[in-house]
């Protein structure tokens, strides 16, 4: 058992700039942290549970975003975060760390809290070393952080597995550790076996090299996935052509927590009881308790402790702890081939030319998606639309005035005149029509239709405006 | 801190081909739409092309479609334009630049690339 | 396609000179417009995003106005080491399109 430990020291702007937060804080805020631990080094990790555990920090002192920039140092919750562990240290673990910012305006439904920055790295740390340094980039902000493991007595070593009980209350000076079991004083620390892999191998007793998890090898110097088949180096199967180990991985039973124990090629496998696993059976359970949904999602816990829980994510993010984010543009919001732009706190469509909408779903060269001015109607065809303006105007959408008169619709010396409702023609003497295209008889009557009752030849005669269309 | 830096200019022949690099540091790569935009000797700015952060989706100028064509390796952060059927009027500095919509997200450093000069002479 | 109208091409101005400069939309673009300034051999430099949101980094006598179809980048006292063209680009759609530029020279 033991102790993960974290220290933040600064959270700020990185070097070039301030950066913008996606949501504008309106009132006073504080800044908090959460840690999650993850065992092992492999990529699937990320979509894991944090199986070694998480902590929340306390909430840091209340600061007021300035309009333009952050403080440079945004103030800091007090203390450490602590990730207590039980049973074995696994050495190599995915180390996450989030800044959250808890705006403490007058929203509904109390404050809202906003991912600034997250950090994911994955480290190999053995047990009671120094405190390792590290300095990370979050976009535009830097985290600077350290952070140790130390075993709690009685266990000690790297891993945190050898239990030592002193028998007497003697305290151990500095470069030493308590006593080996039933001994009554203290030691230095072994020194391992010449060669010993110094990333991979650690000892409890001097002379040794034990692996951390996924290496082995007399100097932990081989990956366990490659350890099964040394080709023609020590005794071989005949049924593999691979080493036959000497004690098998399964003696002395690896898996903790009465986990059962079988052979796999070159290692080992654990079947664990009920509320526990990881590699040896190692991991208690984790419960909504520990808090191990990310980004506001919800914990649902099952019936009994043994069950597993599960985070109900927010939109925009996915993962059994609600930690990776949505590829939302992967679910193609843009129709008609927009871009699909994630801004963060929003998603935005760039539309190709001839289309438009929040979604690019209006087709702007289709009679749906467009309205003609001024009376006008829309005419659609071959993939395109097109206006029929109404007498006086034109253009694209029949937004321009147009002079009916330019085309000089007026026959036989006729004068145009614009109207409200149409084109005008005033005829010439002997003519008539709307376009003065009819001359009149000697004797008064027209050779064809007569002038409506009331129309005596040579007034002015209107031109209905549904004759008359300019087509774009 | 973003930085862009482009690559594979030079001198080519009329009807040649080419291909610009442009190597991306200080942000997620691939999660950024980016763009190729050149200029001419003297001459204003001309946009290229734009490709989606997960290289889905590409855009090209009227001047340049069917001609180029813009890609990115985003387990190398790196931004590509293959310039085929090269002509003289391509002639330009072509800068790399992250997308605009992300400028107020983004404020760290340069959202353009120091530019890569293509001369298209025989 | 949307054609972003710039005026002046170009001007002469003092130091201590209030210059604005304007850019037209053949259509709305909302406010998805840059101006940038560029330096003869230099990259351009952003300075307004989104009509009127100053960069981080860029000084306060620059500011940007408009929405819709007219747009203005206003300098409100000239300095030595602002003369320079400057740009407009539009990024509301597809194809995006620059102004041709206003060159700010010395009077």
């Known amino acids: 058992a033991g102790v993960f430990e974290l220290q933040i020291h600064s959270f700020g702007p990185g070097p070039g700039g301030a950066p913008r937060s996606p949501y504008s804080a309106r009132g006073p805020c504080r800044l908090f942290f959460r840690v999650c631990l993850k065992p092992g080094l492999s990529e699937e990790a990320a979509e894991s549970p944090c199986a070694l555990g998480a902590a929340l920090s306390a909430r840091g002192p209340v600061y007021t975003e300035q309009p333009e920039a952050p403080a440079p140092d945004l103030p800091l919750p007090n203390g450490l975060l602590q990730v207590p562990f039980r049973d074995a240290w696994p050495g190599t673990f995915s180390l996450i760390i989030e800044t959250w910012r808890e705006e403490l305006g007058d929203q509904i439904g109390g404050p809202a809290w906003s991912l600034l920055a997250r950090v994911t790295r994955r480290r190999r740390l053995a047990a009671g070393g120094p405190w390792a340094g590290d300095i990370q980039r979050a976009g535009a902000w830097e985290l600077r952080f350290s952070y140790r493991a130390r075993c709690e007595l009685p266990a000690v070593g790297t891993a945190c597995t050898r239990l030592c009980r002193p028998r007497s209350a003697s305290r151990c000076g500095p470069g030493l550790r308590p006593c080996a079991p039933l001994e009554d004083e203290c030691e230095a620390p072994p020194v391992c076996r010449a060669g010993c892999s110094l990333e991979h191998g650690f000892c409890e007793q001097p002379g040794e090299c034990r692996c951390l998890e996924g290496w082995t090898g007399p100097l932990c110097m081989v990956p366990v996935s490659t350890s099964s088949c040394l080709g023609l180096r020590g005794p071989s199967s005949t049924t593999t052509g691979c080493l036959v180990p000497g004690p098998g991985p399964c003696d002395g039973n690896p898996c903790a927590n009465g986990g059962s124990c079988s052979e796999t090629p070159g290692s080992f496998e654990c079947t664990c009881p009920r509320g526990f696993y990881g590699l040896r059976c190692e991991v208690s359970g984790v419960t909504c308790a520990d808090g191990p949904c990310f980004n506001g999602g919800l914990c649902v816990g099952g019936a009994d402790p043994d069950s597993a829980y599960i985070c109900h994510c927010p939109p925009g993010f996915q993962g059994s702890n609600c930690e990776k984010r949505v590829d939302r543009c992967s679910l193609q919001p843009c129709r008609n081939g927009g871009l699909c732009l994630d801004l963060g706190h929003a998603l935005r469509c760039r539309c190709r030319a001839g289309f438009a909408g929040p979604r690019c779903e209006h087709d702007l060269n289709d009679c749906a998606g467009r309205a003609c001015a001024n009376g006008g109607t829309c005419v659609e065809g071959g993939g395109a639309h097109r206006c029929s303006c109404a007498l006086g105007f034109g253009g694209r959408d029949c937004r321009e005035r147009a002079d009916p008169c330019a085309a000089r619709p007026c026959a036989h010396g006729g004068r145009c005149y614009a109207h409200f409702s149409g084109l005008v023609c005033a005829c010439a003497p002997g003519y008539m029509g709307a376009r003065c295209e009819f001359p009149v008889h000697p004797d008064g009557v027209s050779a064809l239709p007569a002038a409506p009752p009331g129309l005596r030849p040579g007034d002015p005669q209107r031109y209905p405006h549904h004759h008359h269309h300019h087509h774009h | 801190e973003v930085q862009l830096l482009e690559s594979g200019g030079g001198l080519v022949q009329p009807g040649g081909s080419l291909r610009l690099s442009c190597a991306a540091s200080g942000f997620t790569f691939s999660s950024y739409a980016m763009n190729w935009v050149r200029q001419a000797p003297g001459k204003g700015l001309e946009w290229v092309s734009t490709i989606s952060g997960s290289g889905g989706s590409t855009y090209y100028a009227d001047s340049v479609k069917g001609r180029f064509t813009i890609s990115r390796d985003n387990s190398k952060n790196t931004l590509y334009l293959q310039m085929n059927s090269l002509r003289a009027e391509d002639t330009a500095v072509f800068y790399c630049?992250?997308?605009?919509?992300?400028?107020?997200?983004?404020?760290?450093?340069?959202?353009w690339g120091q530019g890569t000069l293509v001369t298209v002479s025989s | 396609d949307i054609q972003m109208t710039q005026s002046p091409s170009a001007m002469s101005a003092s130091v201590g000179d209030r210059v604005t400069i304007t850019c037209r939309a053949s259509q709305g673009i909302s406010n998805y417009l840059a101006w940038f300034q560029q330096k003869p051999g230099k990259v351009p430099k952003r300075l307004i995003y989104?009509?009127?949101s100053l960069q981080s980094g860029v000084p306060s006598r620059f500011s940007g106005s408009g929405s819709g179809t007219e747009f203005t980048l206003t300098i409100s006292s000239l300095q030595p080491e602002d003369f320079a063209t400057y740009f407009c680009l539009q990024h509301d759609s597809f194809p995006l399109t620059f102004g041709g530029g206003t060159k700010v020279e010395i009077k």
């Open positions: 630049a992250i997308d605009p919509e992300y400028y107020d997200i983004l404020t760290g450093g340069d959202y």
């Open positions: 989104a009509a009127s």
